[in-house]
């Protein structure tokens, strides 16, 4: 349940990094509708070392039902999963032949949640139980964040997590999968 059926949309977003120029207005205005065409770059845009359009951060749009025990949301919710590693395209590992690899000791840009939104959801329960209202915290946007090798490894894996989240490695029963588990899975795929 929950993740057995979902819609997946990918959007490349431009990082908000002070040391790089602002993205072209047409990209900024349409960023939530863009579908990763041209790798997030405007067509025919030339490569330049400091060109912000070379830094991409993918927003994956997932539509899923949320649950709590046997109860399930009346309607699916749409959320974002921040995916991929941010960095100049020519320096990323999948760009061998166009340039050099990232230096492990150098700065690292990661695609992480930027803003969250709370959405009130109504959960319908079996057995005639009254519906339950819950507020789920969903990622509303993603950003590229500059990290150094001194950042804690847990921070790389689990941005935006608050202190009282369960510890990693101790999984809930496989009955239902959390958004967080799926996000980690997607992040690790890159």
């Amino acid at each position: 349940q929950g993740w057995q059926a979902f819609k997946n949309d990918a959007t490349e977003i431009i990082p908000e990094l002070g040391e790089y120029p602002e993205p072209p207005p047409e990209l900024e205005n349409n960023k939530t509708m863009n579908r990763a065409e041209n790798g997030g770059r405007p067509p025919h845009h030339p490569f330049e070392t400091k060109d912000v359009s070379e830094y991409s951060c993918r927003e994956l749009h997932f539509t899923r039902y949320v649950t709590d025990g046997p109860c399930r949301s009346a309607k699916p919710v749409t959320e974002l999963v921040c995916s991929g590693q941010c960095g100049p395209a020519r320096l990323l590992p999948n760009a061998i032949g166009r340039g050099k690899w990232w230096r492990p000791s150098g700065p690292d840009f990661r695609c992480i949640p930027d803003r969250y939104r709370a959405q009130r959801v109504q959960l319908l329960c079996p057995g005639g139980e009254a519906p339950r209202a819950r507020k789920v915290r969903l990622v509303a946007s993603c950003k590229c964040k500059r990290l150094t090798r001194f950042h804690n490894q847990s921070e790389l894996k689990d941005f935006g997590t608050e202190a009282a989240r369960p510890q990693k490695g101790r999984k809930p029963r496989p009955r239902a999968r959390s958004a967080k588990a799926n996000q980690a899975e997607l992040e690790n795929a890159y």
Epitope: V77, A118, A133, R137
Partner: antibody, heavy 121, light 106 residues
């Protein structure tokens, strides 16, 4: 850092009312449900109910609707619990807590430090 | 409402012992949470959704169970574990807590 700061201890007369506050920092209370719990001296925990600060909607455990009232002030990020018609049975520590829900589970990671309400003549 | 019965009500153990406390529900529930409370402090989320340790909880703690029977186990008790442990459910309204298990060290 997420914190729930409650008002100080209160000594009140039987039959009177008391208002306990719970001020949140590190998050916007409109994004979460705020719950209230009761713990009588050397006893277990009892759920009173919850409030949605965004719209003021409330839910109560069966024994509390006539006893407790929840209000919120989103401008000061504060939730309030008002207890009326106090008796010695209401002498307890009252806790506020934040409900977190991740799409699979609901739990209470953050609690206030508690407010002791003593009902005595 | 669902009644949670915790046993034993009181435990006195020596450091290094293995301890298991149980929480039984009057009807089947989906999952349970455990809180630790020390005198003069508010309850702390300890085990989340039956088996997940909250942040900062030592790895010697574990939780398990399903249906109507749940348990919290400490593989090797340490002095700092002395506290009262409460279970809590909200699979069915209203939200309820167990009466607690008080763990004391000899």
């Amino acid at each position: 850092e997420v914190q729930l700061q409650q008002s100080g201890a209160d000594l009140v007369q039987p039959g009177a009312s008391v208002k306990v506050s719970c001020t949140a920092s590190g998050f916007d209370i409109k994004d979460y449900y705020i719950h209230w719990m009761k713990q009588r001296p050397d006893q277990g925990l009892e759920w009173i109910g919850r409030v949605d600060p965004d719209n003021g909607e409330t839910e109560f455990a069966p024994k509390f609707p006539g006893k407790a009232t929840f209000t919120t002030d989103t401008s000061s990020n504060t939730a309030y619990l008002q207890l009326r018609g106090l008796t010695s049975e209401d002498t307890a520590i009252y806790y506020c807590g934040r409900e977190d829900y991740d799409g699979t589970y609901t739990w209470f990671p953050y609690w206030g430090q508690g407010t002791l309400v003593t009902v005595s003549a | 409402q669902i009644v949670l019965s915790q046993s034993p009500a009181f435990l006195s153990v020596s450091p290094g012992d293995k301890v298991t406390m149980t929480c039984r529900a009057s009807s089947s529930i989906s999952y349970i949470h455990w809180f630790q409370q020390k005198p003069g402090s508010s309850p702390r989320s300890w085990i989340y959704a039956t088996s997940n340790l909250a942040s900062g909880v030592p790895g010697r703690f574990s939780g398990s169970g399903s249906g109507t029977s749940y348990s919290l186990t400490i593989s090797r008790v340490e002095a700092e574990d002395a506290a009262t442990y409460y279970c809590q459910q909200w699979s069915s309204d209203p939200l309820t807590f167990g009466a607690g298990t008080k763990l004391e060290l000899k």
